[in-house]
């Protein structure tokens, strides 16, 4: 089955923006929202934002979590507000964080 093609006039969503790429803004607009977690020298760095171009998020959002990085994507206004990306933890989850699974 072919990957879904982007629409000519794609819907843009408002997303929460938290992280290095956000500047002074706390939101951004794009075709997909994301919530990510990366491990930098053993420290958890959480980011949220948007992919403004469909192709930009296409591969990233399909990448399964690894021990050093996880990304959760969604489509809908502010849909990443309550999403916390999590690393695979062999059946255990970190205390104080939410589990989120894409259907």
């Amino acid at each position: 089955m072919e990957d879904e093609k982007p629409k000519v006039n794609p819907k843009l969503y408002m997303c929460v923006c938290e992280g290095l790429s956000c500047g002074n803004e706390d939101h951004c607009e794009g075709q997909q929202c994301f919530s990510s977690l990366s491990i930098n020298d053993g420290f958890h760095v959480y980011q949220k934002g948007c992919f403004q171009v469909y192709e930009q998020g296409k591969m990233t959002c399909k990448t399964p979590p690894s021990p050093g990085q996880a990304v959760e994507c969604c489509q809908g206004d502010w849909c990443n507000r309550n999403i916390t990306a999590q690393l695979p933890t062999k059946g255990k989850s970190f205390p104080g964080t939410q589990n989120f699974h894409l259907e």
Partner: antibody, heavy 118, light 106 residues
């Protein structure tokens, strides 16, 4: 109550080795990343190592890479720091610390002093 | 590595004073910054995480602000137990501490 208790410090000659231990209690040890931070006498703080929950990923700054090794034993709720090829500049109080995923270095042990001198 | 520059390196203040300590990062670290308090012979104690979140059990006279490269720790009304050394710490990349700010009694 979270408790982190370091041990194993002492006097060692330059070029020598030492293994520090940090015994943890009051939380589910195997769920948390652990860290070592040091502080030379009268100086500031320096992060020197991190380890993930299962011990499979370890991290070091260049200043100790190749000489220090962090490890953990989740069955004993203990994290270790093996220090080899010690130098005078490694003289410091060594602290063990833990994070929660959202709060880096939330808890610290009381520290153990390592003195490297001939 | 990201350099963290704290200022001032030391300051003298009186009980009841408003005290401000700044930390400047050599590059953008967003809000990935903590503040610690350390007293002589003791381990550092976390005061503020994620730039402006107050750690549980820390008095509300402590507050943090900033994003990007410029950060501030403020003690709204200095208390006798606040005389200590304060460190900022960034974990955006290559974790590093500031050099410390010693708060002394005037």
């Amino acid at each position: 109550e979270v408790q982190l208790v370091e041990s194993g410090g002492g006097l060692v000659q330059p070029g020598g080795s030492l293994r520090l231990s940090c015994a943890a209690s009051g939380f589910t040890f195997s769920n948390y990343y652990m860290y070592w931070i040091r502080q030379a006498p009268g100086k500031g703080l320096e992060w020197i190592s991190s380890i993930n929950t299962d011990g499979g990923s370890t991290y070091y700054p260049d200043s100790v890479k190749g000489r220090f090794t962090i490890s953990r034993d989740n069955s004993k709720n203990t994290v270790y720091l093996q220090m080899n090829s010690l130098r005078a500049e490694d003289t410091a109080v060594y602290y063990c610390a833990k994070s929660t995923p959202n709060i880096p270095l939330a808890y610290w042990g009381q520290g153990t002093l390592v003195t490297v001198s001939s | 590595d990201i350099q963290m520059t704290q200022s001032p390196s030391s300051l003298s203040a009186s009980v009841g004073d408003r005290v401000t300590i700044t930390c400047k990062a050599s590059q953008n670290i967003y809000k990935y910054l903590n503040w610690f308090q350390q007293k002589p012979g003791k381990a550092p104690k976390l005061l503020i995480y994620y730039s402006n979140s107050l750690q549980t059990g820390i008095p509300s006279r402590f507050s943090g602000s900033g994003s990007g490269t410029d950060f501030t720790l403020t003690i709204s009304s200095l208390q006798p137990e606040d005389f200590a050394t304060y460190y900022c710490f960034q974990y955006s990349s290559g974790p590093t501490f500031g050099q410390g700010t010693k708060v002394e009694i005037k």
